[in-house]
């Protein structure tokens, strides 16, 4: 299987880094978006704190933490109503991430 | 240091049912699926099923009804409903990774050292 | 159901040799595949994941190669310590119809 330059293979995802108007104050140079090229039944999500295909189930029904989410070794908890998950390091740190 | 101990692996009679429990150490079961893997003695490896973080289960075709996966925040216990006697087997607990690029496809990298069931009349 | 089928069953090499294991899947599992190696009493341990990626701390002499359903474990120079059974593992977690996951039957290798 064959791709063409700038074709994703499917399933996959990539980190895009855009160029802002340097001319715009307050406004960072550079931002990220994801680019993902997903399957049938697919949806972009996290895992492992990256861009990724995700089954389109987890997002549904909002079980976060089933798309792995958090990096590895840290544990996953969904937020109160599932708004959202924390992960959480070894050391007891938690970020806490909101989905919108 | 990351790693996975089964226990409650004994002899029991058919019919009688019997829960293994896997404690992990060293990393949060809440971060990673989880899977009950067994091998009968002599013979190739056999996938029962696996737990996902919500605690949602998927199983192997033939294990279906015949065994349970459940958790807790420490363990991943697999339960055998109905033991019969081709169900004498080494069972072992093992965490899954996965490779994100293309998905969730799966690999185990960590395993426990298995725990033995036997059952007979 | 997704069916492994690994093949030889086993193989006996002479230390120094290559030794190849194919595992053919019955569908497309989209590079999906692990490879494990197992030793007499001991639980197995990964070599190989997403077909062709080392797991860290095993030997360079093993590699992984396929795509689609066709997939190649190679030990290349194989030495005495590989005297052991290697399964392959195939399928995908989470997809649309849940996860499916089936190991091959095994391939037995002897180092004469």
């Known amino acids: 299987q064959f791709l063409k330059e700038g074709q994703l293979a499917a399933g996959t995802c990539e980190i895009v880094t855009l160029d802002r108007d340097s001319s715009q104050p307050r406004i960072e140079e550079r931002s990220q978006t994801a680019r993902c090229a997903c399957r049938k039944g697919q949806i972009a999500g996290t895992t492992r704190a990256r861009p990724a295909c995700v089954d389109a189930r987890i997002i549904k029904t909002k079980q976060w933490c089933d798309m792995l989410p958090c990096l590895e070794g840290e544990g996953c908890d969904l937020l109160i109503n599932r708004s959202g998950w924390t992960c959480t390091q070894p050391g007891g740190r938690i970020k806490t991430t909101t989905v919108s | 240091q990351e790693q996975l101990v089964e226990s409650g692996g004994r002899l029991v009679t058919p019919g009688t049912p019997l829960t293994l429990s896997c404690t992990a150490s060293?990393?949060?079961?809440?971060?990673?699926?989880m899977s009950w893997v067994r091998q009968a003695p002599g013979k190739g490896l056999e996938w029962i099923g696996i737990?996902?973080?919500?605690?949602s289960t998927d199983y192997a075709s033939w294990a279906k009804g015949r065994f349970t996966i459940s958790k807790t925040s420490t363990t991943v216990d697999l339960k055998i409903t109905t033991p019969t006697t081709e169900d004498t087997a080494t069972y072992f607990c093992?965490?899954?990774?996965?490779?994100?690029?293309?998905?969730?496809?799966?690999?185990?990298?960590?395993w426990g050292p298995g725990t033995l069931v036997t059952v007979s009349l | 159901e997704l069916v492994m089928t690994q093949t030889p069953p086993s193989l006996s090499a002479s230390v120094g040799e290559t030794v190849r294991i194919r595992c053919l899947a019955s569908?497309?599992?989209?590079?999906?595949i692990s490879w494990y190696q197992q030793k007499p009493g001991k639980p197995p341990t990964l070599l190989i994941y997403?077909?062709?990626n080392l797991e860290s701390g095993v030997p360079p002499r093993f590699s992984g190669s396929g795509s689609g359903s066709d997939y190649t474990l190679t030990i290349g120079g194989v030495q005495a310590e590989d005297a052991a059974t290697y399964y392959c593992l195939g399928g995908v977690t989470y997809s649309s119809t849940g996860t499916h996951l089936t190991f091959g039957a095994g391939t037995n290798v002897e180092i004469k």
């Open positions: 093992a965490r899954v990774a996965g490779y994100v690029g293309y998905g969730y496809e799966t690999f185990f990298d960590i």
């Open positions: 569908e497309d599992i989209y590079s999906g």
């Open positions: 997403g077909a062709s």
């Open positions: 737990i996902y973080p919500s605690g």
């Open positions: 060293g990393f949060f079961l809440s971060g990673y699926y």
